[in-house]
């Protein structure tokens, strides 16, 4: 069964810009990836980007760019005002959903401040599985 990982990385030189990286470990056919966040604007879940293997990518503010990093991982870059960034991100959780075949949907979420840039193994804060 594939394992989804998520990491959130602040840019060292620019506190208003950061990236969400997520991927799936192991052997699975990816048909769709959705990156979203919770607690950023309101209590609901906000869709940041959708990445389709063939049809391309779509992103919504504050996401600035979404792209595939490898055949089984993606990256979404977000940009916002510095004051808003500091206040809004404290309670924000970022989630990545991978729709794969034949395993179905796999979701992993990560709080911004629980991400360790030097992490060498996937340790999702939350791993929801819905087949």
């Amino acid at each position: 069964s594939p394992e989804v990982w998520v990491q959130v990385q602040m840019e060292a030189t620019n506190l208003s810009s950061f990236s969400v990286h997520c991927g799936v470990l192991g052997y699975s056919l990816i048909s769709l990836v959705t990156v979203s966040c919770e607690g950023f604007v309101d209590a609901g879940r906000t869709k940041l980007a959708v990445l389709h293997p063939e049809f391309g990518t779509q992103q919504w503010a504050p996401a600035r760019q979404a792209h595939w990093e490898t055949p089984n991982s993606v990256s979404v870059t977000l940009t916002m005002g510095q004051s808003k960034a500091r206040s809004s991100l404290a309670n924000t959780t970022f989630c990545c959903e991978f729709v794969t075949f034949p395993h179905g949907s796999r979701v992993a979420c990560r709080d911004l401040h629980r991400s360790d840039p030097g992490l060498s193994a996937p340790t999702p804060a939350l791993n929801l599985q819905a087949d």
Epitope: H21, P53, H67, W68, T70, P71, S73, S120, A121
Partner: antibody, heavy 123, light 106 residues
Framework: QVQLVQSGAEVKKPGSSVKVSCKAS????????ISWVRQAPGQGLEWMGN????????NYAQKFQGRVTITADESTSTAYMELSSLRSEDTAVYYC????????????????WGQGTLVTVSS | DIQMTQSPSSLSASVGDRVTITCRAS??????LNWYQQKPGKAPKLLIY???SLQSGVPSRFSGSGSGTDFTLTISSLQPEDFATYYC????????FGGGTKVEIK
């Protein structure tokens, strides 16, 4: 234009480990994955695994799971591949290559490649 | 794992010949297929990516086609520098290479 330069040839004893390095120059290192591919003498190409340097997370081919460790050091723009419990069948040229793609679709290919590192396993 | 089967494993041809190499995937891989050329003692060189896109700097006599499970690399007029081994590679689920096709001088 990114260039990948690998460490020199190694001779190892069965049961030991080898660590091969791959240094990138002339472009951004952390934003693209680095794959490792091996080729035994007279044989075909075999993908071993890859790593995304910016997050340090590696994906491995099932065949090498548990025996290979791929790491990256962003500060030196260098990727490493360590293979343990070496046996004679591991004698091969080991290549690193950059996972290159357009980004907006899931199409990826290997370009450029390192020059290769010959690892000989012999008692 | 996805298996990639290349045929033929070797072929003999003359300069000026039209050469066709086929690659078959064990399951559909859409157009996630790349072709490489390798000469003895050298690293592989990318020729074709995404089944049919010619890599920058590669001569136009090389072309790729196919989707799903069946793919073809064609060299329209073989040149002396084209004698080498050719590999296909799928990038749909992780990566797998075909066994290679050695193109030799007749």
């Amino acid at each position: 234009q990114v260039q990948l330069v690998q460490s020199g040839a190694e001779v190892k004893k069965p049961g030991s480990s080898v660590k091969v390095s791959c240094k990138a120059s002339g472009g951004t290192f952390s934003s693209a994955a680095i794959s490792w591919v091996r080729q035994a003498p007279g044989q075909g190409l075999e993908w071993m695994g890859n790593i995304i340097p910016i997050v340090g997370i590696a994906n491995y081919a099932q065949k090498f799971q548990g025996r290979v460790t791929i790491t990256a050091d962003e500060s030196t723009s260098t990727a490493y591949m360590e293979l343990s419990s070496l046996r004679s069948e591991d004698t091969a040229v080991y290549y690193c290559a950059r996972d290159t793609g357009r980004g907006y679709t899931r199409h990826f290919w290997f370009d450029p490649w390192g020059q290769g590192t010959l690892v000989t396993v012999s008692s | 794992d996805i298996q990639m089967t290349q045929s033929p494993s070797s072929l003999s041809a003359s300069v000026g010949d039209r050469v066709t190499i086929t690659c078959r995937a064990s399951q559909s891989i859409s157009s996630y297929l790349n072709w490489y050329q390798q000469k003895p003692g050298k690293a592989p060189k990318l020729l074709i990516y995404a089944a049919s896109s010619l890599q920058s700097g590669v001569p136009s006599r090389f072309s790729g086609s196919g989707s799903g499970t069946d793919f073809t690399l064609t060299i329209s007029s073989l040149q002396p520098e084209d004698f080498a081994t050719y590999y296909c590679q799928q990038s749909d689920i992780l990566y797998t290479f075909g066994g290679g096709t050695k193109v030799e001088i007749k």
